[in-house]
């Protein structure tokens, strides 16, 4: 059976998580993919999400989240800047294959953000607004809305094939919370 | 517990070739990308190869490309590197590992297996 | 191609003191940096990654930090088994993925 298993980040306030997902590209080029927070007991919460069909390169933002799908790599590179402590939690890359249920990657992540910055000197990371700045094409995608038969308890699901899709609820306007990657498929 | 095991190395003439085999274990092996990391005798590491998980993607260092050849077979949890054209600078302990299931970085290796290229 | 450059290249350090290693990267990698250990005639051994962030298994003593092209792993206080060779690693985005120079630490 295939065992999920999570990598933890532990980042401080302000910094900027950066993870990539690995997905095989003859399949998944050009589907949809997502971002997703998972809480205990609940169905997974889609944060953000590709344009469909995805587009190359081509960076999507999502409040705080910005997602680039390079179909050339097979890779989805997921950024959540200026991190908050209450971005904590669980996160999932998954891939959206209508009717099918959401294929998820691996791993998942396990994000920890502490207080206080703790740039060194020399760093020029300590102003995330001056290090990221979004192309004005950036767009914000629509996300479909999934809501998975199956029911989600706190256990990790056991196999791909039993992975539980995201709900149908985001706030595009309000979506400040966490993000979290997994990668190599 | 996951266990990665090299082999293959030996000796080899210059402008010959070898195949180095990599055993994988206590993972999901088509989960997650693998890679080549080599170290000349006495010097530092430098990354080879990687390829990804479903092995539709690979990547390689300027200074093996078109020589070196990186492959896996899923069925089998088992990477190779099909090592063609081989030069003394080639000569070092090629490290097999596993890639990390979110970024680049490699969490666990082989003890590694030493290639020696000289006539 | 990113440089990665560390310093100092040998630290002598006697057992129970504190060490501190340094990695720059020519340009900004964010966190996305690694540090590893290795012993004579044996495979690396991943210590940090993300920056700050301990592998599994890995002493509380090992701790990293830094962000955008300097950064530090500071071991608290030396053990006899962590005389060794650091190396640190950047992965921000596409390959050549590359390794620091290594920074020997010797019991002083």
């Known amino acids: 059976a295939t065992k999920l298993t999570e990598e933890k980040y532990e980042l401080k306030e302000g910094q900027t998580l950066d993870v990539k997902c690995d997905y095989t590209l003859e399949k998944f080029a050009s589907s949809q993919k997502a971002w997703q927070i998972i809480r205990d007991g609940e169905m997974p919460k889609t944060l953000a999400c590709t344009e469909r069909p995805s587009k190359n390169s081509h960076p999507v933002q999502v409040g705080r989240i910005i997602l680039e799908d390079y179909h050339d790599h097979g890779l989805l590179r997921v950024r959540m800047v200026n991190l908050q402590v209450e971005d904590s939690g669980l996160y999932q890359c998954v891939i959206y294959q209508p009717p099918k249920e959401p294929h998820m990657l691996f791993d998942r992540i396990r994000l920890v953000v502490t207080k206080g910055f703790s740039g060194t000197p020399g760093s020029n990371e300590n102003s995330t607004q001056n290090v990221y700045k979004i192309p004005p094409t950036t767009t914000k995608a629509l996300c479909p809305l999934y809501t998975s038969p199956r029911t989600v308890t706190q256990a990790p699901p056991k196999s791909t094939a039993d992975v539980s899709t995201p709900d149908s609820e985001i706030n595009l306007t309000n979506v400040t919370d966490i993000i979290r990657v997994p990668v190599f498929n | 517990e996951v266990q990665v095991l090299e082999s293959g190395g030996g000796l080899v003439q210059p402008g010959g070739s070898l195949r180095l085999s990599c055993a994988a274990s206590g993972f999901t092996f088509n989960a997650y990308a693998m890679s080549w990391v080599r170290q000349a005798p006495g010097k530092g590491l430098e990354w080879v190869s990687t390829i990804s998980g479903s092995g539709s993607t690979t990547y390689y260092a300027d200074s093996v490309k078109g020589r070196f050849t990186i492959s896996r077979d899923n069925s089998k949890n088992t990477l190779d590197l099909q090592m063609n054209s081989l030069r003394a600078a080639d000569t070092a302990v090629y490290y097999c590992?596993?890639?990390?299931?979110?970024?680049?970085?490699?969490?666990?290796w082989g003890q590694g297996t030493l290639v020696t290229v000289s006539s | 191609e990113i440089v990665m450059t560390q310093s100092p290249a040998t630290l002598s350090v006697s057992p129970g003191e504190r060490a501190t290693l340094s990695c720059r990267a020519s340009q900004s990698i964010n966190v996305n940096l690694a540090w590893y250990q290795q012993k004579p005639g044996q495979a690396p051994r991943l210590l940090i990654y993300?920056?700050?962030t301990r592998a599994t298994g890995i002493p509380d003593r090992f701790s990293g930090s830094g962000s955008g092209t300097e950064f530090t792993l500071t071991i608290s206080s030396l053990q006899s088994e962590d005389f060794a060779v650091y190396y640190c690693?950047?992965?921000?985005?596409?390959?050549?993925?590359?390794f620091g120079q290594g920074t020997k630490v010797e019991i002083k």
């Open positions: 690693q950047e992965f921000i985005m596409w390959p050549p993925w590359t």
């Open positions: 590992a596993k890639v990390a299931g979110s970024n680049f970085f490699f969490d666990h």
């Open positions: 993300g920056a700050y």
